[in-house]
Amino acid sequence: QQQTLPKPFIWAEPHFMVPKEKQVTICCQGNYGAVEYQLHFEGSLFAVDRPKPPERINKVQFYIPDMNSRMAGQYSCIYRVGELWSEPSNLLDLVVTEMYDTPTLSVHPGPEVISGEKVTFYCRLDTATSMFLLLKEGRSSHVQRGYGKVQAEFPLGPVTTAHRGTYRCFGSYNNHAWSFPSEPVKLLVTGDIENTSLAPEDPTFPADTWGTYLLTTETGLQKDHALWDHTAQNLLR
């Protein structure tokens, strides 16, 4: 006999990276017929929803209207059908951004390079942080973590046209509190015409969507959570 129900899906809209003082919605999707959903924050009960009528609802939403460092951390949800509880969802790491300062991102030897050249990004922030994150805009979750007292370097090695794109970096004060994003640096990698045509840029969101950070970690923010890309989430663990 089944002792628990399948775990629900949990995600954040518009994104798990939330600028401070902005709104975020935590979504939990379980099964039709669930009479109760519980949202847990850092292991403690945070919110409860008892949807009505339960047979017509399989997803609930929990609002955080004003993101701050106290609300940043790990969330999970569970649901109940009758007396039977589900397994807990995966952990959702909610990150508050736009904290304190803005790092500077630079690239060596420069933003325009030839395929095969070694490229290194440098992220610098003069305030108290020792962890840095380099993110490439787009849907394929190019995220790297680096360390340094005031600067971290991110060697990309010999680049190909697949490295083309727009990069930004963050300073991280802890796993769930990040700085403002740096100004973008667009890396242009030129190769021979044949190679270039065979290696298009990653599909990216329009530049103005950076403000809500719809950029890198989910598979296009699709609701098919079987396609969820955990790269940046795993980076936080």
Partner: nanobody, 130 residues
Framework: EVQLVESGGGLVQPGGSLRLSCAAS????????MGWVRQAPGKGLEWVSA????????YYADSVKGRFTISRDNSKNTLYLQMNSLRAEDTAVYYC???????????????????????WGQGTLVTVSS
């Protein structure tokens, strides 16, 4: 922002009852999940009870379950906490609290952690002593 003013606190003997009230003004009270949070002398904040804006969902901390009842009257912009079978360990300042924002909260959702609340009253002291 919503302004909250609690009343009804006082001195009561163990086993006695009190009814706290919280009058709200400002943001649309009738669409806000609400709660009660308390702080015992020398202790941190402890969430006590919560109610959805429609009153369809109520939730209680284990320490008060079966003794306290939360309710609201949206036509009067007032939140209540009926406290029965009071114990010495219920002695605390009781705060009425509202979630933040002007969002379309579910009619059935409650928030069960002190950190979830944005707007707070000044508190009313409940002392349980013989």
């Amino acid at each position: 922002e919503v302004q909250l003013v609690e009343s009804g606190g006082g001195l009561v003997q163990p086993g006695g009852s009190l009814r706290l009230s919280c009058a709200a003004s400002g943001r649309t009270f009738s669409r806000l999940p609400m709660g009660w949070v308390r702080q015992a002398p020398g202790k941190g904040l402890e969430w006590v009870s919560a109610i959805s804006w429609s009153s369809s969902t109520t939730y209680y901390a284990d320490s008060v379950k079966g003794r306290f009842t939360i309710s609201r009257d949206n036509s009067k912009n007032t939140l209540y906490l009926q406290m029965n079978s009071l114990r010495a360990e219920d002695t605390a300042v009781y705060y009425c609290a509202a979630v933040g924002g002007s969002l379309d909260y579910s009619a059935t959702v409650v928030y069960t952690a002190a950190r979830a609340y944005a707007d707070w009253g000044q508190g009313t002291l409940v002392t349980v002593s013989s």
